[in-house]
Interface confidence: medium
């Protein structure tokens, strides 16, 4: 015998309360597939979350984060506070990267500068809190009298080209 619920399309549910007829999902709920016996509650983008896509009867709402925060987790399940470049988020808030580490984004942790010597290279540009070192040719390749280290380049937003 065919399940009467299998006829219920997305946006409806097979309603126990009405002898298993297909009823539309109530407001603020959805069913993304047919044959569902219940609709799911729409996600609410509240507080630091903001609505990227409204909920419809057939699809859930999608959230992202308000300015000053960024998404974490599958489907932006959490919003985490942004820090400045050169900082990382700790339990006590945004803290500057320790010497020898950098963070070139508004999120994530401070990471150690690259150890150029592991690759047999020299430091071409010193690291900063916001930037990794730039490794250059090996010391043997440098011409006599040339300075081996350049001061750090001014920090800039990742993905932007220099002015």
């Amino acid at each position: 015998l065919q399940d009467p619920c299998s006829n219920c399309p997305a946006g409806t549910f097979c309603d126990n309360n009405r002898n298993q007829i297909c009823s539309p999902c109530p407001p603020n709920s959805f069913s993304s597939a047919g044959g569902q016996r219940t609709c799911d509650i729409c996600r609410q983008c509240k507080g630091v979350f903001r609505t990227r896509k409204e909920c419809s009867s057939t699809s859930n709402a999608e959230c992202d984060c308000t300015p000053g925060f960024h998404c974490l987790g599958a489907g932006c399940s959490m919003c985490e506070q942004d820090c400045k470049q050169g900082q990382e988020l700790t339990k006590k808030g945004c803290k500057d990267c320790c010497f020898g580490t950098f963070n070139d984004q508004k999120r994530g942790i401070c990471r150690p500068w690259t150890n150029c010597s592991l690759d047999g290279k020299s430091v071409l540009v010193n690291g900063t809190k916001e930037r990794d070192v730039v490794c250059g040719p090996s010391p043997a390749d440098l011409s006599p009298g040339a300075s081996s280290v350049t001061p750090p380049a001014p920090a800039r937003e990742p993905g932007h080209s220099p002015q």
Epitope: N16, N17, P26, P27, T38, C39, D40, I41
Partner: antibody, heavy 119, light 107 residues
Framework: QVQLVQSGAEVKKPGASVKVSCKAS????????INWVKQAPGQGLEWIGN????????NYNQKFKDKATITADKSTSTAYMELSSLRSEDTAVYYC????????????WGQGTTVTVSS | DIQMTQSPSSLSASVGDRVTITCRPS??????LNWYQQKPDKTVKLLIY???RLRSGVPSRFSGSGSGTDFTFTISSLQPEDIATYFC?????????FGQGTKLEIK
């Protein structure tokens, strides 16, 4: 916010009837089922029945079929449950609660109405 | 009607303890299992719906799991404000039925 406010406590004599009201606010009254639940003193919860205010479609627990009548007034966003031929075993707290919209769960709940049947 | 067997009927635990309540329906109810909290002042709140989904605004120390005929409700770290009676409820089949409740007290 979504709220259900029930009428006050009632004391009735055996054989009488009582009508408990449940006023809804903060949402579209006609779009969600209203359920009624009984809790006798020191006991658990029992589902009595429900109503869909848009078309007054009702379901009843067979146990309460001859005891309870559930109605709704769309114009005032109020659901009612009338209990007839009252007996001492009808003494209980009666709750109205809205369908949450998923998995046949109930939220929010009214504050409850105490009905005491005593001669 | 589907019978809901909830256990234990009462329990006493200390603040910070992990608390577990079980609910066993008399027949398979898929995931149509919901959990409620009734405070001593008789106010009732939905905590978890569809076995494991936390209602918006409910603290994450509450969780649920299971399927079919075996369900569990857990409070990961008991807080003083969790003193209440907890009920399970099946939404699979009319008439909807509740467990008998678990009264939770603080030691």
């Amino acid at each position: 916010q979504v709220q259900l406010v029930q009428s006050g406590a009632e004391v009735k004599k055996p054989g009488a009837s009582v009508k408990v009201s449940c006023k809804a606010s903060g949402y579209t009254f006609t779009s969600y089922w209203i359920n009624w639940v009984k809790q006798a003193p020191g006991q658990g919860l029992e589902w009595i029945g429900n109503i869909y205010p848009s078309d007054s479609y009702t379901n009843y627990n067979q146990k309460f079929k001859d005891k309870a009548t559930i109605t709704a007034d769309k114009s005032t966003s109020t659901a009612y449950m009338e209990l007839s031929s009252l007996r001492s075993e009808d003494t209980a707290v009666y709750y109205c609660t809205r369908d949450y919209g998923s998995a046949y769960s109930f939220h929010p709940w009214g504050q409850g109405t105490t009905v005491t049947v005593s001669s | 009607d589907i019978q809901m067997t909830q256990s234990p009927s009462s329990l006493s635990a200390s603040v910070g303890d992990r608390v577990t309540i079980t609910c066993r329906p008399s027949q398979d109810i898929s995931n149509y299992l919901n959990w409620y909290q009734q405070k001593p002042d008789k106010t009732v709140k939905l905590l978890i719906y569809y076995t494991s989904r936390l209602r918006s605004g409910v603290p994450s120390r509450f969780s649920g799991s299971g399927s079919g005929t075996d369900f569990t409700f857990t409070i990961s770290s008991l807080q003083p404000e969790d003193i209440a009676t907890y009920f399970c409820q099946q939404g699979d089949t009319l008439p909807y039925t509740f467990g008998q409740g678990t009264k939770l007290e603080i030691k």
